[in-house]
């Protein structure tokens, strides 16, 4: 559970995260397990520890081995292990299985290929993408943030895709590559203008002052996996994150469900400790995809608590 395999290529950057859960404020000590030697934290070292992260800048084949991270909270010390393997660069174009990240599959309607592990690095767009060592060119290929989008996917698009990016550490640049297989599913799906199932348009939701309230925005977008579909909440026409009221939060991540084969998403708006001023706000459930945007508005009204007579 707390041992994680990581791999990289010599002369590239490799960053590994300790597989233990902790807070940013916790101290994390790293050791090379075979010698029990502490990993330095000074950035002038080629291999150094930086909190939850262990950085090889760049990696060498001799760095391969098991590294121990000890996460020290005020109450406990927890141990995790990173099993690191650094491979020599291949002279030919073949990417061996042991360098491959998990396979992803796509379809005509949805063809996102995420660049693995990129969130650990300090990189700037654009990413470079290769298929079978050839740089991808043409309008069908779009590098967007940390993923590649392929338009009008065909079965011939299946294969091994490599992303390449530059990690920057204190002004020094290091190359990183990561490869994963992409398979193409034949999917008879379709996309519709969003249909909001809940809430009803101009719904009035009764809430109790001082209590917590949840509003669910639920919409369906068609059949099969959908490309660029989202549901979200707005307050008085403003994104929740920009509104600046910590009591009112969107649930992290959107739940995806398939009801009757339809692809649906829902987003829960949680209001903690409902206040009088919350009743004055306009709550908009927004559903959008490539076809357009649909909006349903909800308002809150005060629910009078039932008197309990003892």
């Amino acid at each position: 559970k707390f041992s994680k395999q990581s791999w990289g290529l010599e002369n590239e950057a490799l960053i590994v995260r300790c597989p233990r859960q902790g807070k940013p404020s916790y101290t994390v000590d790293w050791y090379y397990s075979q010698t029990n030697k502490s990993i330095p934290t000074q950035e002038r070292n080629r291999v150094f520890a930086s909190g939850q992260l262990l950085k090889f800048l760049p990696a060498a084949v001799a760095d391969s081995g098991i590294y121990t991270c000890i996460v020290r909270s005020p109450t406990f010390n927890r141990t995790g292990y990173a099993n690191v393997t650094i491979y020599k660069k291949q002279s030919d174009c073949n990417v061996p299985d042991y360098l491959m990240y998990s396979t992803v599959s796509g379809s005509e309607k949805n063809s996102k290929i995420y660049c693995p592990t990129i969130d650990l690095y300090n990189w700037t767009a654009p990413l470079e993408w290769f298929k079978n060592c050839q740089a991808l060119q043409g309008s069908r290929y779009r590098a967007h943030k940390s993923f590649l989008v392929i338009d009008n996917v065909m079965t011939e698009d299946a294969g091994d895709y490599t992303c390449k990016f530059i990690h920057n550490e204190n002004g020094a640049n290091y190359s990183v590559t990561a490869t994963r297989s992409f398979t193409v599913k034949d999917e008879q799906g379709f996309s519709l203008f969003p249909v909001i199932g809940a809430p009803a348009q101009n719904e009035i939701k009764e809430v109790e002052i001082g209590k917590n309230a949840n509003l669910t925005c639920s919409a369906c977008f068609g059949k099969g996996t959908q490309f660029l579909a989202a549901v979200l909440w707005q307050l008085n026409g403003t994104k929740i994150t920009d509104f600046g009221e910590p009591r009112i939060q969107q649930e992290e991540g959107q739940n995806q469900s398939f009801s009757n084969g339809l692809a649906c998403l829902d987003m829960v708006l949680r209001i903690a400790d409902v206040k009088e001023e919350d009743l004055l706000l306009q709550y908009d459930c927004l559903a959008l995809n490539l076809h357009g945007l649909r909006r349903h508005t909800v308002r809150l009204s005060r629910k009078n608590p039932i008197d309990h007579h003892s």
């Epitope: 559970k1 902790g22 916790y26 909270s73 005020p74 109450t75 406990f76 927890r78 910590p246």
Partner: antibody, heavy 117, light 106 residues
Amino acid sequence: EVQLQQSVAELVRPGASVKLSCTASAFNIKDDYMHWVKQRPEQGLEWIGRIDPAIGNTEYAPKFQDKATMTADTSSNTAYLQLSSLTSEDTAVYYCALGDFYAMDYWGQGTSVTVSS
Amino acid sequence: ETTVTQSPASLSVATGEKVTIRCITNTDIDDVIHWYQQKPGEPPKLLISEGNTLRPGVPSRFSSSGYGTDFVFTIENTLSEDVADYYCLQSDNMLTFGAGTKLELK
């Protein structure tokens, strides 16, 4: 020495809500996680959930998702557990306990909540 | 959701005897299990943390073993002060306590 101070007892009516407090001394609650645990009379321990007081992130056991709300006020070094729509099933001792993500080490003495009309 | 089955529910032993309590989980949790002691009218006390690590100040007659799904907690040479309820806690997936074992003296 780390101490967690909880009120001794609460008597509440069915259907009402109650907010329990837990104040830490000799320890900054921001530095770790606060867990809440329920123990019904003559029964075992049930984990309610945990909160990271530094950022307010919470995680609840599925059973308590709609029953409990955990909050924290770092300025007063106090964690809170609010229980809503109380029934006799909620009659129990509620413990706060400090620990990391995985377990609890320091415990309060518990607040006894009695739901009765 | 990871569930924990603890046995026995209660046991009675003479002073000096060995006590064995078992917890079984429905999923492989490596060694992420903790053991608590609770005496009447008191909050629980952590005796052993994950990886079979004895907490500071806990007597060495307490120990635990196990990995994966099967875990055992042992008291060697039980003393009268060990009369209490004992709980295992898994924290691989959320946190779940075992149902508890009541230890009494004959």
